[in-house]
Each structure stands twice: as structure tokens, then as C-alpha cells.
Interface confidence: low
């Protein structure tokens, strides 16, 4: 779940609403109850018939999904609505990058040793913001209302609990989980931060305040400079309220605007290959701004020709994005797989 291993995650929303994987039992690796097929659940509230455009990912399959904004993906396990007819799915790959897991907190000593606090309006981001402000790397939410701060060294001695133990709804947000009884849901504080300098070979950048909705009048910048001569960005989530909420991508060296996306003009679905080694991302929201925001993964490319469409060109220093640009490259049968 680290921000530096985004390729391992199938989910980028805190409640797994974007899960489109193929787990079809309530437990991982064949454990748990088998799920019913969504096209055979018309007697229930949710079925493929209630999702004709596939917006929620329902269809002629029995994969776990979250069509109703619940706290995590789930599925129906029984035909009738007597007793337990649905269950949450425990999907190890469905945790947003930056979520480090569910940890045991016995309280003596606490799993995260830094400052703590409680709030009847606790959300994941409220805790992240608190710990960020205190200068800590990690934030942990517990029992729906408690927030703890700590550092990587705390986790080294921490004990992982089953993911399903962190099942308590945050007091401040019905669509988020905030740990459990004696269980701490731990996040990296860089999630939803308003600034950052990203130099790891790959990673994830979230909109400010994520996983909460971004707030009004936000003006945030992130510098990307992973090793390599070029960059690849992939938007995993993009929901801006209107055209006045805008994300700009600029070449860090020249300040040249490479592209701007906004609520009316979202990014395309595929990876953006940018022939610049250093990128500046700027996000601005207007006075009304409130929406889920964005999550994007990036990875450094060794050269700007790591592009399946790019024919080999004559040697020239890459500094701006373009498929098929003349850049120095070595022969290769095809581009490497995405991270």
C-alpha cells in the first residue's frame, strides 16, 4: 500500500468504489463465501440492470464491487434478504496507495508513539492533516474517532491485523473507515497533501484533502523529478467540480504549460508520456470547489522513446512531451509494461 508501489494497488479511492478487479469471493485467495452474479440479483437493490452504463462496474459477473458508496467493496451471498445476504469483501489489492494497513494497537505502548487526539468529526484527512502539521510521517485512525501520529520506526515493531478488523466508519464521513477497536488504520501523511517534492522512481499524487473532497480556494503544487529522462502519468481518478477547478502540468525547467485539465476537460484514459524529466503539477480550485479530486500514478522512464507509438528517431535531447519525437533511444521490440 505504499505510495511508492502504486502498481500493486487496484484501488485509488478510500472505499474501493473504483475496484474493477476479479475477486469473486468474500475472502482472498479462494477464502470466504462465493459471490452471486450481479445479473442474477434483480430481487436485491443492486444488479446489472440497475447499472446499465456500467458506472459502478456491475455486469454479467460475480466480482466484488461497491455500487452504493459503502465503505468497501461487497457482494451478495444469498438469493433472499433473510439473514446475512451480503458481505464485505476482503481484497488485499484494494487499498489505496498510501494506506499501509490495519495494525494492532494494544495501547501499551501505542502502535504510533507520537501525539494523538480525538474528534467527533474525524475523517482520514482530518487525521492526516493533524499529523502532517505535527511533523510526523504517519497517521493512524482508530475506533472511528481517534487519531495517532508516528514514524516509520513505529511500524517496524507493529503487528499487522486482518484488513477486515479496520471496519469502523469514521465519525465524520460515512464513506470512510477509521480503524477498529484496538485497530489502527495507518496512512502516509503525504496522501492529500497540498505540496510535495517527488523523486522516487514511481509514486502516486492525490488531490489536496484526499480522500476527503478537496476544499475551496486551494492552490497546490507538486514537483516531480524521478530518475530518468521522461515521465509517464496515468490518471486513476479524476473528478473536478467545474471548469474553474484546474490541474496544470508544466515543464519544471522552462515553465512551459504542457496541458491543463479541468472539470469540463478531464484527461484521457491512457498513460501520458511526457518527454521531460522534471514536471510541476499545480492544482487550483475556486471558491465553491468541492469534489472527489484526482489520483494519478507516475513513473520515471529511462528515455522519452519508451512509447509504443514512437518510431526511432535521430538523437536529440528530449525536453518536451511528444510521441514519436526525435530522441536518442536504443532498439527495443516494445515498450516495457506499465508499473
Amino acid at each position: 500500500g505504499s505510495l511508492h508501489s502504486p502498481g500493486l494497488s487496484e484501488c485509488f479511492q478510500v472505499n474501493g468504489a473504483d475496484y474493477r478487479g476479479h475477486q469473486n469471493r468474500t475472502g482472498p485467495r479462494g477464502a470466504g463465501r462465493p459471490c452471486l452474479f450481479w445479473d442474477q440479483t434483480q430481487q436485491h437493490s443492486y444488479s446489472s440492470a440497475s447499472d446499465p452504463h456500467g458506472r459502478w462496474g456491475l455486469g454479467a459477473h460475480n466480482f466484488c464491487r461497491n455500487p452504493d458508496g459503502d465503505v468497501q467493496p461487497w457482494c451478495y451471498v444469498a438469493e433472499t434478504e433473510e439473514g446475512i445476504y451480503w458481505r464485505y469483501c476482503d481484497i488485499p489489492s484494494c487499498h489505496m496507495p498510501g494506506y499501509l494497513g490495519c495494525f494492532v494497537d494494544s495501547g501499551a505502548p501505542p502502535a504510533l508513539s507520537g501525539p494523538s487526539g480525538t474528534s467527533t468529526k474525524l475523517t482520514v484527512q482530518v487525521c492526516l492533516r493533524f499529523c502532517r502539521m505535527k511533523g510526523y510521517q504517519l497517521a493512524g485512525v482508530e475506533a472511528g474517532y481517534a487519531c495517532f501520529c508516528g514514524s516509520e520506526s513505529d511500524l517496524a515493531r507493529g503487528r499487522l491485523a486482518p484488513a477486515t478488523d479496520c471496519d469502523q466508519i469514521c465519525f465524520g464521513h460515512p464513506g470512510q473507515l477509521c480503524g477498529g477497536d484496538g485497530r489502527l488504520g495507518v496512512y502516509e501523511v503525504s496522501v492529500g497533501s497540498c505540496q510535495g517534492n517527488w523523486t522516487a522512481p514511481q509514486g502516486v499524487i492525490y488531490s489536496p484533502d484526499f480522500p476527503d473532497e478537496y476544499g475551496p480556494d486551494r492552490n497546490c503544487s507538486w514537483a516531480l523529478g524521478p530518475p530518468g529522462a521522461a515521465l509517464e502519468l496515468t490518471f486513476r481518478l479524476f473528478e473536478l467540480a467545474d471548469p474553474r477547478d484546474r490541474l496544470e502540468l508544466r515543464d519544471a525547467a522552462s515553465g512551459s504549460l504542457l496541458r491543463a485539465f479541468d472539470g469540463a476537460r478531464p484527461p484521457p484514459s491512457g498513460p501520458l508520456r511526457l518527454g521531460t524529466a522534471a514536471l510541476l503539477l499545480t492544482f487550483r480550485s475556486d471558491a465553491r470547489g468541492h469534489a472527489q479530486g484526482f489520483a494519478l500514478t507516475y513513473r520515471g522512464l529511462q528515455d522519452a522513446a519508451e512509447d509504443p507509438e514512437a518510431p526511432e528517431g535521430s538523437a536529440q535531447t528530449p525536453a518536451a512531451p511528444l510521441d514519436g519525437a526525435n530522441v536518442s533511444c536504443s532498439p527495443r521490440p516494445g515498450a516495457p509494461p506499465a508499473a
Epitope: S256, L258, R259, P266, P268, L272, D307, A320, L322, G324
Partner: antibody
């Protein structure tokens, strides 16, 4: 290889509408914006707007707002540009043009569709 | 909208000549300028992007320079196939706008 193939020439009367198609191949259609650019006889190039095929969201040049509609059909990898209330000064060659991977120029163009508006 | 003013509107030159075309933006567009070549009855072809980067397959005799508001396309040694109309375009913000074009004719 990337190809954009447009529909044939059209002759229309003033006040009518025209719908030009642009069939894309050789790349993942939903991964790139499709732009529409027109060129009146002997004149320069004028950007009309673009469409994001993945979301179906479009962005129009203010000059054409209210008269132009851009759509896509993902199943056939085809983009469409409809221009309504045609006037004689809409006589032009209409091009579809695909964005580059980095969005810094129009890397691929259709062959163009001549639309003649005449009474 | 950002205006792109190209000059000259036409130029007569001979094979082997050095040809320079300029483009002035009505406001700062950083290096967000592309250059296209268009021959009669054909679609434009991308030559230069981000002011100075040659697109794939474009001969090295074509070069671009400039930033801010002033940009230049240079053909170092004009070849017979280079007689065409050339357009600059800013992609700094929406809507992208083109210059009026420069026709390079045989002297």
C-alpha cells in the same frame, strides 16, 4: 500505424447542417483527444474544438459554441463533428486531428472533408 | 484568445537558400509553439513542437527557436520539396490559435 479517415465531400444549402465523420485506427481511440480544425479556401487554420473520447466531454472554440457538436462512437473508434445553421462562410475543408501523446501539437491529421455551402 | 502574427506572409527563395519565418504571440506563451508545413490539397504536417523540438522524420534543416512572444522557424538550405505554406500555432492555452501562414515560393 495511426490513420484518420474522414467522410467524403458535402454540398449543403445555407441554414442546413453537416455531420463529418473521422474513423481512427492504429491506436487506442479513447487515449487521445480528437480535435477539429477548419480551413476556408485560401485561408489559414482555425481550431473549432476537441473531444475527449473516453469521457465524451468536449471543449469548443467560443466562436462556434451553440452551432457545433462533437461526438464519438467508441465502438467504431469514430469521431463526429456536426455544424448547424450553415452559412456561406462555413465553406471550408474540415480536418480531424489527433493530439500527440504529450499534447503539444497535432501529430496526426485526417485527409480533410470539403464542405461547400451554397444556395 | 492569443493572437499569433506571422511574417512575412510570403517569401520567394531559391533552392539552397536559408529561409527564416517569424511568429509573434500577443502574450507570453513560454515555449508552447508548434510549426506545421502544408502543401496544396494536403493536411498540415507537424514539423516542430515546443518551439525547438523536431518531430519524427523531420529533416535536420528545419529548426525552431524562441520563447515568450517571439518565435522563429528556419530552413537552413531550402530543398525543392520545401516549397509550401508554413503555420505557427500556440498550444499554451485554449483555444489553440494559428498564425496566418507564410507561403514559401520559388523565386
Amino acid at each position: 500505424q495511426v490513420q484518420l479517415v474522414q467522410s467524403g465531400a458535402e454540398v449543403k444549402k445555407p441554414g442546413a447542417s453537416v455531420k463529418v465523420s473521422c474513423k481512427a485506427s492504429g491506436y487506442t481511440f479513447t487515449d487521445y483527444y480528437m480535435n477539429w480544425v477548419r480551413q476556408a479556401p485560401g485561408q489559414g487554420l482555425e481550431w473549432m474544438g476537441d473531444i475527449n473520447p473516453y469521457y465524451g466531454s468536449s471543449n469548443y472554440n467560443q466562436k462556434f459554441k451553440g452551432r457545433v457538436t462533437m461526438t464519438t462512437d467508441k465502438s467504431t473508434s469514430t469521431a463526429y463533428m456536426e455544424l448547424r445553421s450553415l452559412r456561406s462562410d462555413d465553406t471550408a475543408v474540415y480536418y480531424c486531428a489527433r493530439d500527440s501523446s504529450g499534447y503539444v501539437g497535432f501529430a496526426y491529421w485526417g485527409q480533410g472533408t470539403l464542405v461547400t455551402v451554397s444556395s | 484568445d492569443i493572437q499569433m502574427t506571422q511574417s512575412p506572409s510570403s517569401v520567394s527563395a531559391s533552392v539552397g537558400d536559408r529561409v527564416t519565418i517569424t511568429c509573434k504571440a500577443s502574450q507570453d506563451v513560454s515555449t508552447s509553439v508548434a510549426w506545421y508545413q502544408q502543401k496544396p490539397g494536403k493536411a498540415p504536417k507537424l514539423l516542430i513542437y515546443s518551439a525547438s523540438y523536431r518531430y519524427t522524420g523531420v529533416p535536420s534543416r528545419f529548426s525552431g527557436s524562441g520563447s515568450g512572444t517571439d518565435f522563429t522557424l528556419t530552413i537552413s538550405s531550402l530543398q525543392p520539396e520545401d516549397f509550401a505554406t508554413y503555420y505557427c500555432q500556440q498550444h499554451y492555452n485554449t483555444p489553440p490559435t494559428f498564425g496566418g501562414g507564410t507561403k514559401v515560393e520559388i523565386k
